[in-house]
Interface confidence: medium
Protein backbone atom coordinates (compact mmCIF):
# COMPACT_ATOMS: atom_id res chain seq x y z
CA UNK A 1 0.00 0.00 0.00
CA UNK A 2 1.77 3.16 -1.18
CA UNK A 3 -0.14 5.27 1.35
CA UNK A 4 1.62 3.35 4.15
CA UNK A 5 5.11 4.17 2.87
CA UNK A 6 5.66 7.49 4.73
CA UNK A 7 4.43 5.95 8.00
CA UNK A 8 6.68 2.91 7.46
CA UNK A 9 9.70 5.11 6.78
CA UNK A 10 9.04 7.24 9.87
CA UNK A 11 8.75 4.09 11.96
CA UNK A 12 11.95 2.59 10.56
CA UNK A 13 13.78 5.78 11.44
CA UNK A 14 12.99 5.22 15.12
CA UNK A 15 15.42 2.65 16.61
CA UNK A 16 12.99 1.83 19.42
CA UNK A 17 10.30 0.76 16.96
CA UNK A 18 9.83 -1.42 13.88
CA UNK A 19 7.19 -1.67 11.19
CA UNK A 20 5.06 -4.82 11.08
CA UNK A 21 3.77 -5.33 7.53
CA UNK A 22 1.27 -7.97 8.62
CA UNK A 23 -0.67 -5.57 10.82
CA UNK A 24 0.55 -2.41 8.97
CA UNK A 25 1.49 -0.76 12.23
CA UNK A 26 4.50 0.70 13.96
CA UNK A 27 5.43 -1.55 16.88
CA UNK A 28 7.47 -1.00 20.00
CA UNK A 29 10.73 -3.00 19.98
CA UNK A 30 11.01 -4.97 23.21
CA UNK A 31 14.40 -4.60 24.91
CA UNK A 32 16.80 -7.54 24.86
CA UNK A 33 15.70 -10.23 27.31
CA UNK A 34 12.01 -9.32 27.09
CA UNK A 35 9.37 -10.89 24.87
CA UNK A 36 6.24 -9.23 23.44
CA UNK A 37 2.91 -10.23 24.99
CA UNK A 38 1.13 -9.42 21.72
CA UNK A 39 1.98 -9.40 18.04
CA UNK A 40 2.63 -5.67 17.83
CA UNK A 41 3.58 -4.23 21.19
CA UNK A 42 2.83 -0.52 21.60
CA UNK A 43 4.54 0.27 24.90
CA UNK A 44 7.02 -1.20 27.43
CA UNK A 45 4.12 -2.74 29.37
CA UNK A 46 3.50 -4.99 26.36
CA UNK A 47 6.88 -6.69 26.91
CA UNK A 48 7.67 -9.28 29.52
CA UNK A 49 10.38 -11.60 30.72
CA UNK A 50 10.07 -15.14 29.38
CA UNK A 51 10.21 -18.18 31.65
CA UNK A 52 11.10 -21.77 30.84
CA UNK A 53 8.40 -24.40 30.35
CA UNK A 54 6.58 -25.21 33.61
CA UNK A 55 7.56 -21.85 35.13
CA UNK A 56 5.48 -18.69 35.33
CA UNK A 57 6.30 -15.04 35.92
CA UNK A 58 5.25 -14.21 39.49
CA UNK A 59 4.20 -10.82 40.86
CA UNK A 60 7.82 -10.05 41.77
CA UNK A 61 8.86 -10.65 38.14
CA UNK A 62 10.63 -13.92 38.93
CA UNK A 63 10.27 -17.18 37.06
CA UNK A 64 8.74 -19.59 39.57
CA UNK A 65 7.87 -23.27 39.19
CA UNK A 66 4.21 -23.99 38.49
CA UNK A 67 2.82 -26.50 40.97
CA UNK A 68 2.86 -30.11 39.87
CA UNK A 69 -0.35 -32.15 39.66
CA UNK A 70 1.58 -35.39 39.24
CA UNK A 71 0.29 -36.97 42.44
CA UNK A 72 -2.28 -39.58 41.49
CA UNK A 73 -5.13 -38.06 43.46
CA UNK A 74 -4.77 -34.70 41.66
CA UNK A 75 -5.89 -33.47 38.26
CA UNK A 76 -4.98 -30.29 36.45
CA UNK A 77 -7.74 -27.68 36.68
CA UNK A 78 -5.84 -24.81 35.03
CA UNK A 79 -2.66 -25.10 32.97
CA UNK A 80 0.65 -23.41 33.69
CA UNK A 81 0.48 -20.02 31.93
CA UNK A 82 3.11 -17.34 31.42
CA UNK A 83 1.79 -15.29 34.34
CA UNK A 84 0.03 -17.84 36.54
CA UNK A 85 0.73 -21.20 38.09
CA UNK A 86 -0.87 -24.46 37.15
CA UNK A 87 -3.85 -25.16 39.44
CA UNK A 88 -4.54 -28.67 40.69
CA UNK A 89 -7.62 -30.09 42.34
CA UNK A 90 -8.60 -33.46 43.73
CA UNK A 91 -9.61 -36.01 41.12
CA UNK A 92 -13.31 -36.82 40.63
CA UNK A 93 -14.70 -38.73 43.58
CA UNK A 94 -12.43 -36.96 46.05
CA UNK A 95 -12.39 -33.68 47.96
CA UNK A 96 -9.65 -31.51 49.40
CA UNK A 97 -9.08 -31.85 53.13
CA UNK A 98 -5.89 -29.77 53.34
CA UNK A 99 -5.58 -26.91 50.85
CA UNK A 100 -2.31 -25.36 49.74
CA UNK A 101 -1.69 -22.55 47.25
CA UNK A 102 -2.91 -23.66 43.80
CA UNK A 103 -3.28 -27.28 44.89
CA UNK A 104 -4.33 -29.69 47.62
CA UNK A 105 -2.01 -31.32 50.13
CA UNK A 106 -4.46 -34.08 51.07
CA UNK A 107 -7.38 -35.50 49.13
CA UNK A 108 -9.99 -37.84 50.63
CA UNK A 109 -12.60 -39.99 48.95
CA UNK A 110 -16.15 -38.62 49.09
CA UNK A 111 -18.18 -40.31 51.77
CA UNK A 112 -20.94 -42.69 50.79
CA UNK A 113 -24.15 -41.95 52.66
CA UNK A 114 -24.91 -44.80 55.07
CA UNK A 115 -28.17 -46.74 54.99
CA UNK A 116 -31.14 -44.56 55.91
CA UNK A 117 -29.39 -41.43 54.66
CA UNK A 118 -29.49 -39.75 51.25
CA UNK A 119 -27.23 -37.26 49.52
CA UNK A 120 -28.18 -33.70 50.33
CA UNK A 121 -25.23 -32.12 48.51
CA UNK A 122 -23.00 -34.26 46.30
CA UNK A 123 -19.28 -34.10 46.99
CA UNK A 124 -17.14 -31.70 44.95
CA UNK A 125 -13.39 -31.25 44.58
CA UNK A 126 -13.56 -28.89 47.56
CA UNK A 127 -16.30 -30.37 49.76
CA UNK A 128 -17.28 -33.79 51.03
CA UNK A 129 -20.70 -35.32 50.42
CA UNK A 130 -23.38 -33.98 52.77
CA UNK A 131 -25.98 -36.54 53.82
CA UNK A 132 -29.44 -36.11 55.32
CA UNK A 133 -32.02 -38.58 56.65
CA UNK A 134 -34.09 -40.21 53.93
CA UNK A 135 -37.71 -39.03 53.67
CA UNK A 136 -40.35 -41.58 54.67
CA UNK A 137 -41.46 -43.68 51.73
CA UNK A 138 -38.20 -43.31 49.84
CA UNK A 139 -36.05 -46.40 49.49
CA UNK A 140 -32.81 -45.50 51.27
CA UNK A 141 -30.75 -47.66 48.96
CA UNK A 142 -31.80 -45.87 45.78
CA UNK A 143 -32.69 -42.37 46.93
CA UNK A 144 -29.79 -41.07 44.83
CA UNK A 145 -27.68 -42.47 42.01
CA UNK A 146 -24.70 -42.73 44.34
CA UNK A 147 -26.63 -44.94 46.73
CA UNK A 148 -27.67 -47.35 43.98
CA UNK A 149 -24.03 -48.40 43.82
CA UNK A 150 -23.70 -49.49 47.40
CA UNK A 151 -20.56 -51.49 48.21
CA UNK A 152 -21.22 -55.13 48.95
CA UNK A 153 -19.13 -55.19 52.12
CA UNK A 154 -19.91 -52.08 54.09
CA UNK A 155 -19.71 -48.38 53.37
CA UNK A 156 -17.36 -45.59 54.25
CA UNK A 157 -18.87 -43.76 57.20
CA UNK A 158 -19.54 -40.14 56.40
CA UNK A 159 -17.43 -38.99 59.30
CA UNK A 160 -14.47 -40.98 58.03
CA UNK A 161 -13.56 -40.00 54.48
CA UNK A 162 -10.79 -42.18 53.13
CA UNK A 163 -7.36 -40.57 52.86
CA UNK A 164 -5.27 -41.47 49.86
CA UNK A 165 -2.92 -38.54 49.61
CA UNK A 166 -0.04 -38.31 48.99
CA UNK A 167 0.51 -42.08 49.11
CA UNK A 168 -1.23 -43.02 52.28
CA UNK A 169 -4.14 -45.26 53.09
CA UNK A 170 -6.17 -46.53 55.98
CA UNK A 171 -7.56 -49.94 55.29
CA UNK A 172 -10.13 -49.79 58.07
CA UNK A 173 -12.19 -47.11 56.35
CA UNK A 174 -11.90 -48.42 52.84
CA UNK A 175 -14.47 -50.71 51.20
CA UNK A 176 -12.61 -53.77 50.02
CA UNK A 177 -14.83 -54.69 47.13
CA UNK A 178 -17.51 -52.59 45.46
CA UNK A 179 -16.66 -49.03 44.65
CA UNK A 180 -12.93 -49.53 44.90
CA UNK A 181 -11.91 -48.41 41.43
CA UNK A 182 -10.37 -45.15 42.60
CA UNK A 183 -8.62 -46.93 45.41
CA UNK A 184 -7.26 -49.51 43.02
CA UNK A 185 -6.00 -46.81 40.68
CA UNK A 186 -4.35 -44.99 43.54
CA UNK A 187 -2.65 -48.17 44.69
CA UNK A 188 -1.60 -49.18 41.22
CA UNK A 189 0.27 -45.91 40.84
CA UNK A 190 2.08 -45.76 44.15
CA UNK A 191 5.41 -46.37 42.46
CA UNK A 192 5.12 -43.42 40.12
CA UNK A 193 7.70 -40.64 40.14
CA UNK A 194 6.41 -37.07 39.77
CA UNK A 195 5.14 -36.55 36.30
CA UNK A 196 6.33 -39.88 35.00
CA UNK A 197 3.89 -42.18 33.23
CA UNK A 198 1.64 -44.41 35.31
CA UNK A 199 2.79 -47.98 35.90
CA UNK A 200 6.08 -47.59 34.05
CA UNK A 201 8.39 -45.36 36.00
CA UNK A 202 10.61 -44.59 33.06
CA UNK A 203 11.33 -41.02 31.98
CA UNK A 204 9.30 -39.75 29.07
CA UNK A 205 10.79 -37.30 26.67
CA UNK A 206 8.69 -34.36 25.55
CA UNK A 207 8.13 -35.08 21.88
CA UNK A 208 6.13 -31.89 21.46
CA UNK A 209 3.15 -31.83 19.16
CA UNK A 210 2.57 -34.11 16.25
CA UNK A 211 -0.36 -34.34 13.91
CA UNK A 212 -3.01 -37.05 13.96
CA UNK A 213 -2.30 -37.08 10.26
CA UNK A 214 0.45 -34.88 8.79
CA UNK A 215 -0.45 -31.49 10.25
CA UNK A 216 -2.06 -29.27 7.61
CA UNK A 217 -1.05 -25.60 7.64
CA UNK A 218 -3.34 -23.65 9.92
CA UNK A 219 -5.17 -26.77 11.02
CA UNK A 220 -6.08 -27.59 14.58
CA UNK A 221 -5.62 -31.29 13.86
CA UNK A 222 -2.38 -31.54 15.81
CA UNK A 223 -1.83 -33.44 18.99
CA UNK A 224 0.91 -34.32 21.39
CA UNK A 225 2.59 -37.57 20.40
CA UNK A 226 3.37 -40.25 22.95
CA UNK A 227 5.97 -42.96 22.89
CA UNK A 228 5.04 -46.51 21.84
CA UNK A 229 2.86 -48.21 24.47
CA UNK A 230 1.73 -44.86 25.88
CA UNK A 231 -1.53 -43.04 25.22
CA UNK A 232 -2.65 -39.45 25.64
CA UNK A 233 -4.93 -39.34 28.68
CA UNK A 234 -7.72 -36.84 29.39
CA UNK A 235 -5.27 -34.51 31.12
CA UNK A 236 -3.07 -34.47 28.00
CA UNK A 237 -0.39 -36.63 29.61
CA UNK A 238 1.36 -39.58 28.01
CA UNK A 239 0.36 -42.53 30.18
CA UNK A 240 1.47 -46.13 29.91
CA UNK A 241 -1.01 -48.51 28.37
CA UNK A 242 -1.63 -51.51 30.59
CA UNK A 243 0.21 -54.70 29.78
CA UNK A 244 -1.61 -57.94 28.99
CA UNK A 245 1.59 -59.98 29.28
CA UNK A 246 0.42 -62.05 32.24
CA UNK A 247 -0.44 -65.62 31.20
CA UNK A 248 -4.07 -65.38 32.27
CA UNK A 249 -4.76 -62.20 30.25
CA UNK A 250 -5.51 -61.53 26.60
CA UNK A 251 -5.70 -58.25 24.75
CA UNK A 252 -9.25 -57.10 24.12
CA UNK A 253 -8.46 -53.76 22.46
CA UNK A 254 -5.05 -52.43 21.45
CA UNK A 255 -3.15 -49.44 22.78
CA UNK A 256 -4.29 -46.42 20.73
CA UNK A 257 -3.07 -42.83 20.66
CA UNK A 258 -5.88 -41.68 22.96
CA UNK A 259 -6.85 -44.82 24.88
CA UNK A 260 -5.18 -47.56 26.84
CA UNK A 261 -4.90 -51.17 25.82
CA UNK A 262 -7.68 -53.20 27.46
CA UNK A 263 -7.00 -56.66 28.81
CA UNK A 264 -9.45 -59.34 29.82
CA UNK A 265 -9.17 -62.79 31.31
CA UNK A 266 -8.44 -65.52 28.80
CA UNK A 267 -11.24 -67.89 27.82
CA UNK A 268 -12.29 -70.18 30.65
CA UNK A 269 -11.42 -67.63 33.31
CA UNK A 270 -13.34 -64.81 34.94
CA UNK A 271 -12.14 -61.63 36.59
CA UNK A 272 -12.24 -61.80 40.38
CA UNK A 273 -10.44 -58.52 41.09
CA UNK A 274 -10.79 -55.86 38.46
CA UNK A 275 -8.57 -52.85 37.94
CA UNK A 276 -8.58 -50.10 35.34
CA UNK A 277 -8.49 -51.50 31.79
CA UNK A 278 -7.47 -54.97 32.95
CA UNK A 279 -7.91 -57.59 35.63
CA UNK A 280 -5.72 -57.91 38.69
CA UNK A 281 -6.79 -61.53 39.31
CA UNK A 282 -8.40 -64.03 37.00
CA UNK A 283 -9.90 -67.25 38.39
CA UNK A 284 -11.05 -70.38 36.56
CA UNK A 285 -14.76 -70.28 35.75
CA UNK A 286 -16.92 -71.23 37.59
CA UNK A 287 -14.66 -72.75 40.28
CA UNK A 288 -13.21 -70.41 42.87
CA UNK A 289 -9.41 -70.53 42.78
CA UNK A 290 -7.16 -70.50 45.80
CA UNK A 291 -5.39 -67.30 46.69
CA UNK A 292 -2.54 -66.51 44.35
CA UNK A 293 0.06 -63.79 44.33
CA UNK A 294 0.37 -62.19 40.93
CA UNK A 295 3.47 -60.19 40.09
CA UNK A 296 2.49 -56.82 38.66
CA UNK A 297 3.64 -56.37 35.09
CA UNK A 298 5.07 -53.20 33.63
CA UNK A 299 5.49 -51.57 37.03
CA UNK A 300 9.16 -50.73 36.86
CA UNK A 301 12.04 -51.03 34.46
CA UNK A 302 15.62 -51.67 35.47
CA UNK A 303 16.43 -47.97 35.40
CA UNK A 304 13.58 -46.81 37.56
CA UNK A 305 13.94 -45.69 41.12
CA UNK A 306 11.17 -47.80 42.63
CA UNK A 307 10.27 -51.43 42.43
CA UNK A 308 6.76 -52.84 42.44
CA UNK A 309 5.69 -53.88 45.93
CA UNK A 310 5.09 -57.60 46.49
CA UNK A 311 1.48 -58.54 46.13
CA UNK A 312 -0.62 -60.81 48.28
CA UNK A 313 -4.12 -60.61 46.89
CA UNK A 314 -7.30 -61.11 48.86
CA UNK A 315 -9.11 -64.41 48.45
CA UNK A 316 -12.18 -63.52 46.44
CA UNK A 317 -14.84 -65.89 45.16
CA UNK A 318 -17.03 -63.34 43.41
CA UNK A 319 -18.49 -64.98 40.30
CA UNK A 320 -18.70 -61.58 38.58
CA UNK A 321 -16.55 -58.49 38.51
CA UNK A 322 -17.37 -56.29 41.50
CA UNK A 323 -18.39 -53.08 39.82
CA UNK A 324 -19.59 -54.15 36.41
CA UNK A 325 -16.87 -52.14 34.69
CA UNK A 326 -14.40 -53.37 32.13
CA UNK A 327 -11.80 -55.60 33.76
CA UNK A 328 -8.80 -53.63 34.79
CA UNK A 329 -5.02 -53.24 35.33
CA UNK A 330 -2.33 -55.66 36.36
CA UNK A 331 -1.52 -53.43 39.28
CA UNK A 332 -2.38 -54.54 42.81
CA UNK A 333 -5.52 -53.29 44.50
CA UNK A 334 -5.10 -50.97 47.46
CA UNK A 335 -6.37 -53.64 49.80
CA UNK A 336 -3.78 -56.07 48.51
CA UNK A 337 -1.01 -53.53 49.02
CA UNK A 338 -2.20 -52.80 52.52
CA UNK A 339 -2.69 -56.42 53.55
CA UNK A 340 0.47 -57.85 52.09
CA UNK A 341 2.62 -58.92 55.03
CA UNK A 342 5.59 -58.97 52.69
CA UNK A 343 5.30 -55.22 52.21
CA UNK A 344 7.30 -54.19 55.25
CA UNK A 345 8.70 -51.33 53.22
CA UNK A 346 6.82 -49.66 50.43
CA UNK A 347 9.27 -48.59 47.73
CA UNK A 348 7.57 -45.30 47.01
CA UNK A 349 9.14 -41.83 47.11
CA UNK A 350 11.76 -41.88 49.83
CA UNK A 351 9.90 -39.22 51.79
CA UNK A 352 6.33 -40.46 51.44
CA UNK A 353 4.42 -39.95 54.69
CA UNK A 354 3.65 -43.56 55.34
CA UNK A 355 4.42 -45.44 58.51
CA UNK A 356 4.08 -49.11 59.30
CA UNK A 357 2.22 -50.47 62.29
CA UNK A 358 3.25 -53.61 64.14
CA UNK A 359 0.99 -55.58 61.83
CA UNK A 360 2.97 -54.40 58.85
CA UNK A 361 0.07 -52.30 57.60
CA UNK A 362 0.58 -48.68 56.60
CA UNK A 363 -0.86 -46.13 58.99
CA UNK A 364 -1.56 -42.53 58.16
CA UNK A 365 1.23 -40.16 59.16
CA UNK A 366 -0.43 -36.89 60.14
CA UNK A 367 2.74 -35.01 59.14
Amino acid sequence: FPQDRPFEDTCRGNPGHYYDKAVRRCCYRCPTGLFPTQQCPQRPADCRKQCEPDYYLDEAGRCTACVSCSRDDLVEKMPCAWNSSRVCECQPGMFCAVSVVNSCARCFFHSVCPAGMIVKFPGTAQKNTVCEPASPGVSPACASPENCKEPSSGTIPQAKPTPVSPATSNASTMPLRGGTRLAQEAASKLTRAPGSPSSVGRPSSDPGLSPTQPCPQGSGDCRKQCEPDYYLDEAGRCTACVSCSRDDLVEKTPCAWNSSRICECRPGMICATSATNSCARCVPYPICAAETGTKPQDMAEKDTTFEAPPVGTQPDCSPTPENGEAPASTSPTLSSLVDSQASKTLPIPTSAPIALSSTGKPVLDAG
Epitope: G33, Q50, V67, S68, S70, P194, P203, S205, C238, A352
Partner: antibody, heavy 123, light 107 residues
Framework: EVQLQESGGGLVQPGGSLRLSCAAS????????IHWVRQAPGKGLEWVSY????????DYNQNFKGRFTTSANKSKNTAYLQMNSLRAEDTAVYYC????????????????WGQGTLVTVSS | DIELTQSPSSLSASVGDRVTITCKAS??????VAWYQQKPGKAPKVLIY???YRYSGVPSRFSGSGSGTDFTLTISSLQPEDFATYYC?????????FGQGTKLEIK
Amino acid sequence: EVQLQESGGGLVQPGGSLRLSCAASGFTFTTYTIHWVRQAPGKGLEWVSYINPSSGYSDYNQNFKGRFTTSANKSKNTAYLQMNSLRAEDTAVYYCARRADYGNYKYTWFPYWGQGTLVTVSS
Amino acid sequence: DIELTQSPSSLSASVGDRVTITCKASQNVGTNVAWYQQKPGKAPKVLIYSASYRYSGVPSRFSGSGSGTDFTLTISSLQPEDFATYYCQQYHTYPLTFGQGTKLEIK
Protein backbone atom coordinates in the same frame (compact mmCIF):
# COMPACT_ATOMS: atom_id res chain seq x y z
CA GLU B 1 23.68 -40.82 24.40
CA VAL B 2 23.42 -37.21 25.54
CA GLN B 3 26.79 -35.47 25.43
CA LEU B 4 27.90 -31.91 26.17
CA GLN B 5 31.43 -30.70 25.56
CA GLU B 6 32.75 -27.29 26.58
CA SER B 7 35.73 -25.59 24.96
CA GLY B 8 37.29 -22.14 24.72
CA GLY B 9 38.64 -21.79 28.25
CA GLY B 10 42.12 -20.50 28.98
CA LEU B 11 44.14 -17.68 30.46
CA VAL B 12 42.90 -14.13 29.91
CA GLN B 13 43.90 -10.77 31.36
CA PRO B 14 41.54 -8.74 33.56
CA GLY B 15 39.24 -6.64 31.37
CA GLY B 16 39.62 -9.13 28.53
CA SER B 17 37.01 -11.26 26.75
CA LEU B 18 36.54 -14.94 26.09
CA ARG B 19 33.92 -17.03 24.28
CA LEU B 20 33.12 -20.49 25.54
CA SER B 21 31.42 -23.12 23.38
CA CYS B 22 29.21 -26.03 24.37
CA ALA B 23 28.81 -28.66 21.64
CA ALA B 24 25.73 -30.82 22.17
CA SER B 25 24.93 -34.24 20.72
CA GLY B 26 22.62 -37.18 21.36
CA PHE B 27 19.39 -35.16 21.59
CA THR B 28 17.35 -32.61 19.65
CA PHE B 29 19.25 -29.42 20.40
CA THR B 30 16.29 -27.08 19.94
CA THR B 31 14.08 -29.00 22.39
CA TYR B 32 15.99 -28.26 25.59
CA THR B 33 17.43 -25.16 27.19
CA ILE B 34 21.18 -25.16 27.78
CA HIS B 35 22.45 -23.69 31.04
CA TRP B 36 25.84 -22.40 32.13
CA VAL B 37 27.00 -23.09 35.70
CA ARG B 38 30.39 -22.09 37.05
CA GLN B 39 32.54 -23.20 39.96
CA ALA B 40 35.40 -21.10 41.35
CA PRO B 41 38.41 -23.11 42.63
CA GLY B 42 37.51 -24.77 45.93
CA LYS B 43 34.06 -23.12 45.91
CA GLY B 44 30.48 -24.12 45.24
CA LEU B 45 28.33 -24.12 42.10
CA GLU B 46 26.83 -20.89 40.75
CA TRP B 47 24.17 -20.67 38.04
CA VAL B 48 25.11 -18.16 35.33
CA SER B 49 22.50 -18.20 32.54
CA TYR B 50 20.59 -20.25 30.02
CA ILE B 51 19.72 -20.11 26.34
CA ASN B 52 16.64 -21.47 24.58
CA PRO B 53 18.23 -22.58 21.29
CA SER B 54 14.85 -22.68 19.57
CA SER B 55 13.86 -19.06 20.22
CA GLY B 56 17.23 -17.55 21.07
CA TYR B 57 15.83 -16.34 24.37
CA SER B 58 18.31 -16.03 27.25
CA ASP B 59 18.01 -15.34 30.96
CA TYR B 60 20.81 -14.45 33.37
CA ASN B 61 21.78 -14.40 36.98
CA GLN B 62 21.77 -10.65 37.79
CA ASN B 63 25.40 -10.94 38.93
CA PHE B 64 26.43 -11.51 35.31
CA LYS B 65 23.90 -9.50 33.32
CA GLY B 66 25.57 -6.98 31.07
CA ARG B 67 28.97 -8.69 31.03
CA PHE B 68 27.98 -12.17 29.90
CA THR B 69 25.89 -13.06 26.84
CA THR B 70 24.57 -16.46 25.81
CA SER B 71 23.76 -17.44 22.23
CA ALA B 72 23.29 -20.57 20.16
CA ASN B 73 23.91 -21.84 16.65
CA LYS B 74 21.18 -24.33 15.77
CA SER B 75 22.96 -25.68 12.69
CA LYS B 76 26.07 -26.45 14.74
CA ASN B 77 24.17 -27.72 17.82
CA THR B 78 26.35 -25.40 19.87
CA ALA B 79 25.65 -22.92 22.67
CA TYR B 80 28.02 -20.08 23.50
CA LEU B 81 28.86 -17.97 26.53
CA GLN B 82 30.47 -14.66 25.62
CA MET B 83 32.27 -13.20 28.65
CA ASN B 84 33.42 -9.56 28.58
CA SER B 85 35.14 -7.27 31.10
CA LEU B 86 36.52 -10.30 32.90
CA ARG B 87 37.70 -10.00 36.49
CA ALA B 88 39.95 -12.14 38.65
CA GLU B 89 36.85 -13.40 40.52
CA ASP B 90 35.51 -14.87 37.25
CA THR B 91 38.27 -17.50 37.44
CA ALA B 92 36.35 -20.78 37.52
CA VAL B 93 35.49 -24.00 35.75
CA TYR B 94 32.52 -23.28 33.49
CA TYR B 95 30.08 -26.10 32.84
CA CYS B 96 27.23 -26.31 30.37
CA ALA B 97 24.30 -28.48 31.46
CA ARG B 98 21.00 -29.62 30.00
CA ARG B 99 17.77 -29.54 31.95
CA ALA B 100 15.76 -32.65 32.71
CA ASP B 101 13.09 -34.32 30.59
CA TYR B 102 11.61 -36.60 33.23
CA GLY B 103 7.87 -37.05 33.10
CA ASN B 104 5.32 -34.43 32.22
CA TYR B 105 6.87 -31.58 34.13
CA LYS B 106 10.03 -29.98 32.85
CA TYR B 107 11.67 -28.49 35.88
CA THR B 108 15.23 -27.19 35.82
CA TRP B 109 17.52 -29.71 37.41
CA PHE B 110 20.48 -31.13 35.55
CA PRO B 111 21.00 -34.79 34.69
CA TYR B 112 23.48 -33.94 31.92
CA TRP B 113 26.70 -31.93 32.31
CA GLY B 114 29.77 -31.28 30.21
CA GLN B 115 33.23 -31.96 31.65
CA GLY B 116 33.86 -28.24 32.21
CA THR B 117 36.40 -25.77 30.86
CA LEU B 118 38.73 -23.73 33.06
CA VAL B 119 38.85 -19.96 32.67
CA THR B 120 41.71 -18.19 34.46
CA VAL B 121 41.63 -14.40 34.70
CA SER B 122 45.02 -13.13 35.74
CA SER B 123 47.61 -10.54 34.78
CA ASP C 1 17.33 -14.76 45.61
CA ILE C 2 16.66 -17.98 47.50
CA GLU C 3 19.60 -18.95 49.69
CA LEU C 4 20.35 -22.59 50.45
CA THR C 5 22.36 -23.36 53.57
CA GLN C 6 23.87 -26.83 53.85
CA SER C 7 25.05 -28.37 57.07
CA PRO C 8 27.50 -29.56 58.00
CA SER C 9 30.06 -27.93 55.68
CA SER C 10 32.23 -30.99 56.08
CA LEU C 11 32.09 -34.28 57.93
CA SER C 12 34.24 -37.34 58.46
CA ALA C 13 32.70 -40.78 58.41
CA SER C 14 33.64 -44.41 57.93
CA VAL C 15 32.54 -47.02 55.42
CA GLY C 16 29.21 -48.48 56.57
CA ASP C 17 28.15 -45.36 58.46
CA ARG C 18 24.77 -43.71 58.02
CA VAL C 19 25.21 -40.07 56.99
CA THR C 20 22.69 -37.23 56.85
CA ILE C 21 23.21 -33.87 55.15
CA THR C 22 20.67 -31.09 55.51
CA CYS C 23 19.78 -28.19 53.25
CA LYS C 24 17.72 -25.24 54.47
CA ALA C 25 16.06 -22.82 52.04
CA SER C 26 15.49 -19.16 52.90
CA GLN C 27 11.91 -19.48 51.64
CA ASN C 28 9.42 -22.15 50.65
CA VAL C 29 10.52 -24.05 47.55
CA GLY C 30 7.93 -26.84 47.66
CA THR C 31 9.70 -30.05 46.67
CA ASN C 32 11.69 -28.39 43.90
CA VAL C 33 15.08 -29.50 45.18
CA ALA C 34 17.77 -31.70 43.63
CA TRP C 35 20.91 -33.20 45.18
CA TYR C 36 24.22 -33.69 43.37
CA GLN C 37 27.44 -35.55 44.09
CA GLN C 38 30.72 -34.12 42.83
CA LYS C 39 34.18 -35.65 42.88
CA PRO C 40 37.38 -33.62 42.38
CA GLY C 41 37.96 -32.62 38.75
CA LYS C 42 34.59 -34.02 37.66
CA ALA C 43 31.19 -32.55 36.81
CA PRO C 44 28.37 -32.94 39.35
CA LYS C 45 26.08 -35.98 39.07
CA VAL C 46 22.41 -35.80 40.02
CA LEU C 47 21.31 -38.17 42.78
CA ILE C 48 17.85 -36.96 43.81
CA TYR C 49 15.24 -34.74 42.16
CA SER C 50 11.86 -33.48 43.39
CA ALA C 51 13.30 -33.71 46.93
CA SER C 52 12.77 -37.46 47.26
CA TYR C 53 13.04 -39.26 43.91
CA ARG C 54 16.22 -41.13 43.05
CA TYR C 55 17.51 -40.53 39.55
CA SER C 56 17.87 -43.66 37.42
CA GLY C 57 20.98 -45.68 38.17
CA VAL C 58 21.52 -44.09 41.59
CA PRO C 59 22.05 -46.72 44.32
CA SER C 60 19.19 -47.22 46.77
CA ARG C 61 21.39 -46.25 49.72
CA PHE C 62 20.83 -42.62 48.69
CA SER C 63 17.51 -41.16 49.75
CA GLY C 64 16.06 -37.68 50.00
CA SER C 65 13.25 -36.17 52.00
CA GLY C 66 11.70 -32.86 52.94
CA SER C 67 9.49 -30.12 51.56
CA GLY C 68 9.03 -26.40 52.05
CA THR C 69 12.30 -25.16 53.54
CA ASP C 70 13.99 -28.21 55.09
CA PHE C 71 15.54 -31.00 53.06
CA THR C 72 17.71 -34.00 53.87
CA LEU C 73 20.00 -36.28 51.90
CA THR C 74 20.72 -39.59 53.63
CA ILE C 75 23.30 -42.21 52.71
CA SER C 76 22.23 -45.32 54.60
CA SER C 77 25.53 -47.21 54.49
CA LEU C 78 28.59 -45.36 53.20
CA GLN C 79 30.59 -47.02 50.46
CA PRO C 80 34.19 -46.07 49.54
CA GLU C 81 32.98 -44.39 46.32
CA ASP C 82 30.61 -42.08 48.24
CA PHE C 83 33.37 -39.83 49.61
CA ALA C 84 32.79 -36.63 47.65
CA THR C 85 31.17 -33.20 47.93
CA TYR C 86 27.37 -32.98 47.92
CA TYR C 87 25.29 -30.00 46.78
CA CYS C 88 21.60 -29.21 47.00
CA GLN C 89 19.93 -27.07 44.32
CA GLN C 90 16.57 -25.30 44.31
CA TYR C 91 14.79 -24.96 40.99
CA HIS C 92 11.63 -23.41 42.36
CA THR C 93 12.44 -19.82 41.45
CA TYR C 94 14.98 -18.14 39.20
CA PRO C 95 17.81 -17.48 39.65
CA LEU C 96 18.57 -21.12 40.31
CA THR C 97 20.73 -21.46 43.41
CA PHE C 98 22.92 -24.13 44.99
CA GLY C 99 23.96 -24.83 48.57
CA GLN C 100 27.59 -24.15 49.47
CA GLY C 101 28.35 -27.88 49.54
CA THR C 102 29.13 -30.55 52.12
CA LYS C 103 32.46 -32.32 51.87
CA LEU C 104 32.29 -35.93 53.01
CA GLU C 105 35.71 -37.28 53.99
CA ILE C 106 37.03 -40.63 55.19
CA LYS C 107 37.53 -40.79 58.95
